[in-house]
């Protein structure tokens, strides 16, 4: 067993900077755009453009805003309640199994295949066999004949966290 080590009359923990507004938690939780103070008495606002929180929470700190990588475009900026939305640049896409980087879309389909889907920020061009109509996935073999594709139209974010 061990006894006490204590400090009396401490300065309030984690004082908010002047720009950080405070409010009281509701049932131990703080609203989106805030985090809770260490003593649980205050909700401290996230800093616009620096961090955010999307739900009612008791987080120790707001979450750091994502910075879009080179090769990505910023669809919407980080706010106190929503993370930055980044999207792969035109002509590139992000696969689910390699979300860390945007990859170049293929310029065309292998011989014997026809393009049925454009390059989008979240998918490569889609090729199917002319006869069977079955999809082709994976890397392009040595291309003998290609069907040129036009860049996809940006639609929805391929990197959305928050």
């Amino acid at each position: 067993e061990s006894a006490l080590i204590t400090q009396q009359d401490l300065a309030p923990q984690q004082r908010a900077a002047p720009q950080q507004k405070r409010s009281s938690p509701s049932e131990g939780l703080c609203p989106p755009g805030h985090h809770i103070s260490e003593d649980g008495r205050d909700c401290i606002s996230c800093k616009y453009g620096q961090d955010y929180s999307t739900h009612w929470n008791d987080l120790l700190f707001c979450l750091r805003c994502t910075r879009c990588d080179s090769g990505e475009v910023e669809l919407s900026p980080c706010t106190t309640t929503r993370n930055t939305v980044c999207q792969c640049e035109e002509g590139t896409f992000r696969e689910e199994d390699s979300p860390e980087m945007c990859r170049k879309c293929r310029t065309g389909c292998p011989r014997g295949m026809v393009k049925v889907g454009d390059c989008t920020p979240w998918s490569d061009i889609e090729c199917v066999h002319k006869e069977s109509g079955t999809k082709h996935s994976g890397e392009v073999p040595a291309v003998e004949e290609t069907v040129t594709s036009s860049p996809g139209t940006p639609a929805s974010p391929c990197s959305l966290s928050g």
Epitope: I5, T6, G40, N57, D58, L60, F61
Partner: antibody
Framework: QMQLVQSGGGLVKPGGSLRLSCAAS????????MSWIRQAPGKGLEWVSA????????YYADSVKGRFTISRDNSKNTLYLQMNSLRAEDTAVYYC?????????WGRGTMVTVSS | QPVLTQPPSASGTPGQRVTISCSGS????????VNWYQQLPGTAPKLLIQ???QRPSGVPDRFSGSKSGTSASLAISGLQSEDEADYYC???????????FGPGTKLTVL
């Protein structure tokens, strides 16, 4: 008077389990983030884990993730650290402390020795 | 390689001023408050400076903290023999989503 009283340390074999307890008094326990910090013999301080006042948010050091579980019982004003799959490198004095990133009240520590 | 770096040792004579440095990165010191802890031999650590430069009550004003960019420092003026201890800087690290301590600086009063 604010205090943290620790118990539950001891000698355990590698792969074994142990539960540490930290009883708080003198402040509104359920309001505060609480943490565990450890110190291997002759070494520096290493943060282990933190938990929010309600227990809704928890944080862990990579070195203990998946093996240690922090929890609390606000009705008993007690903080716990359940340690499973213990390794020799977990040998340390374990401190409980008030706060999640500013530790203003510390327990006296309890020794955990992992050895065969 | 520690996330925060501190000199392993520092020393001074009684009455002198001593400074202990702490270097980090944008994910910790650069964006979060720095705390300093003092650990006297055989005892639990004690909060010495919080929020970069705030002294909890009971901490003598001989101790002061500062932060600039990704570095912080602790200054002790009018050094006394009872200041002989280990000093740790610490901060939350956003990349690790956890709290990090520096390796500690052993202060010897000559």
């Amino acid at each position: 008077q604010m205090q943290l009283v620790q118990s539950g340390g001891g000698l355990v074999k590698p792969g074994g389990s142990l539960r540490l307890s930290c009883a708080a008094s003198g402040f509104t326990f359920s309001d505060y983030y609480m943490s565990w910090i450890r110190q291997a013999p002759g070494k520096g301080l290493e943060w282990v884990s933190a938990i929010s006042g309600s227990g809704g948010s928890t944080y862990y050091a990579d070195s203990v993730k998946g093996r240690f579980t922090i929890s609390r019982d606000n009705s008993k004003n007690t903080l716990y650290l359940q340690m499973n799959s213990l390794r020799a490198e977990d040998t340390a004095v374990y401190y409980c402390a008030r706060g999640g990133s500013t530790f203003d009240i510390w327990g006296r520590g309890t020794m955990v020795t992992v050895s065969s | 390689q520690p996330v925060l770096t501190q000199p392993p040792s520092a020393s001074g004579t009684p009455g002198q001023r001593v400074t202990i440095s702490c270097s980090g990165s944008n994910s910790n010191i650069g964006s979060r408050p720095v705390n300093w802890y003092q650990q006297l031999p055989g005892t639990a650590p004690k909060l010495l400076i919080q929020g970069n430069n705030q002294r909890p009550s009971g901490v003598p004003d001989r101790f002061s903290g500062s932060k600039s960019g990704t570095s912080a420092s602790l200054a002790i003026s009018g050094l006394q023999s009872e200041d002989e201890a280990d000093y740790y800087c610490a901060a939350w690290d956003d990349s690790l989503t956890g709290y990090v301590f520096g390796p500690g600086t052993k202060l010897t009063v000559l």
